[in-house]
Amino acid sequence: QRFAQAQQQLPLESLGWDVAELQLNHTGPQQDPRLYWQGGPALGRSFLHGPELDKGQLRIHRDGIYMVHIQVTLAICSSTTASRHHPTTLAVGICSPASRSISLLRLSFHQGCTIASQRLTPLARGDTLCTNLTGTLLPSRNTDETFFGVQWVRP
Amino acid sequence: QRFAQAQQQLPLESLGWDVAELQLNHTGPQQDPRLYWQGGPALGRSFLHGPELDKGQLRIHRDGIYMVHIQVTLAICSSTTASRHHPTTLAVGICSPASRSISLLRLSFHQGCTIASQRLTPLARGDTLCTNLTGTLLPSRNTDETFFGVQWVRP
Amino acid sequence: QRFAQAQQQLPLESLGWDVAELQLNHTGPQQDPRLYWQGGPALGRSFLHGPELDKGQLRIHRDGIYMVHIQVTLAICSSTTASRHHPTTLAVGICSPASRSISLLRLSFHQGCTIASQRLTPLARGDTLCTNLTGTLLPSRNTDETFFGVQWVRP
């Protein structure tokens, strides 16, 4: 019985399987390009199992290789709006600790109103991920249009 | 010997690893925006290990957090076609049971001819996922251009 | 003690978890549409754990179902450049052995300057994946704009 329990706990506890899916809470003040995220069952279908939020930014709790994914949709947008307000760019990166600061993923909107991508990247305990939206257009807060998540893949 | 077998089976049987990758079978009749999917080794590189198809819609067999991904390419399309026929929108959601109905993922084509995205979401045994393509443009059935899949990630 | 070690090794050694994330090294000569990739800790955040590079192309070492993902950004690009140089297309496929040659994933740039997608597909030991960029535009070598990776998901 105890062995069976240990088995079931193993992947979640020992091996990680840290995972988070976040929804947009709000954008930053004027000079702050960061998006601020929120997550938890009370908010719908977002959640954090392992990683934590620190002032709206995602902080990693377990070393490993992660799949990072994001989709951002602009709120009031047509292809003409998007091209007129170009460049509007979304970048996901490690923003702290400063010694590990790096851009992981970058996309421009050009004539589109949604960007979506994903990548594998090594992350370390304590890394905080920031998502910077530069330009004058605002993101949609609809939970099926704008979301950001990570999934622990292996040590 | 028996213990070693149990070990190897554990992730697939006990822990899940349910996974499916589907190819487009057909579009619905006139007033039905749903795409109808098919999968299986006889059809090429599509497969279902755990989830099942119910009248062309994907039904989940195991509770857990899933990575859902989709790519849809329009069959006859240029950036001018796409903008002239705007809005063409793709939405992935839980369509049954009705009590759990929700849109999980939504993208518009704007001036593009392909949308592709992915997200993490909790799904429960019995949830049926529907993919609704609204607008007048038709999807490509090429298996490298249009596909839909889910991957169980953790309980 | 020995049992605990065996437990920790099981997913990585016995069950696979092969994973790779590559960055662009260079494009091919005139008539060769393939992108040539590189990976390893000395190069930044790219890595190979299981799969190998063979003359810049990714070779699979373990049978299984894989999540394949890619993002390619064009180097000097605006929506007008992209539409003027249309069609620019990215295809990911098995290019060897010849008997298993097939296109897995295909996207056109239309009026956009970045494509990004992912899919689940069965791959076998010895399969070599090629990424063909057709058209006259060149890809960006920025590691946050152009990358290609695979993740073993299950047997």
Partner: nanobody, 119 residues
């Protein structure tokens, strides 16, 4: 097994009309995506018109408003009515049938019919 045979190609003056036909022999005709591709010399093959089993249609921007695709499920025939033709419509036109149901993905192509538009 499905056989697909095109007819109706030929030469026409700019501004003129032609009607292409495609006879499909085989089961479940009404369950096919069907369409017309064309390929001009030195160019890529292009899908110009598509029709579903229940009659929904899509057209390439270059032919929209000039070409009309239709099908007669009783006669197992697909048509492409081409009006206000232009020299750039010169190409080999191929009928295409794409199967839905059953065990597998089946695509069927005709041998093509030449259409030439002179100015």
């Amino acid at each position: 097994e499905v056989q697909v045979v095109e007819s109706g190609g030929g030469m026409v003056q700019a501004g003129g009309s032609l009607r292409l036909s495609c006879a499909a022999s085989g089961k479940r005709f009404s369950f096919y995506f069907m369409g017309w591709y064309r390929q001009a010399p030195g160019k890529q093959r292009e899908l110009v018109a598509l029709i579903t089993g229940d009659g929904r249609t899509n057209y390439a921007g270059s032919v929209e408003g000039r070409f009309t695709i239709s099908r007669d499920n009783a006669k197992n025939t697909l048509y492409l009515q081409m009006n206000s033709m232009k020299p750039e419509d010169t190409a080999v036109y191929y009928c295409y049938a794409d199967a839905f149901a059953g065990a597998g993905r089946d695509e069927y192509w005709g041998q093509g019919t030449q259409v030439s538009v002179s100015s």
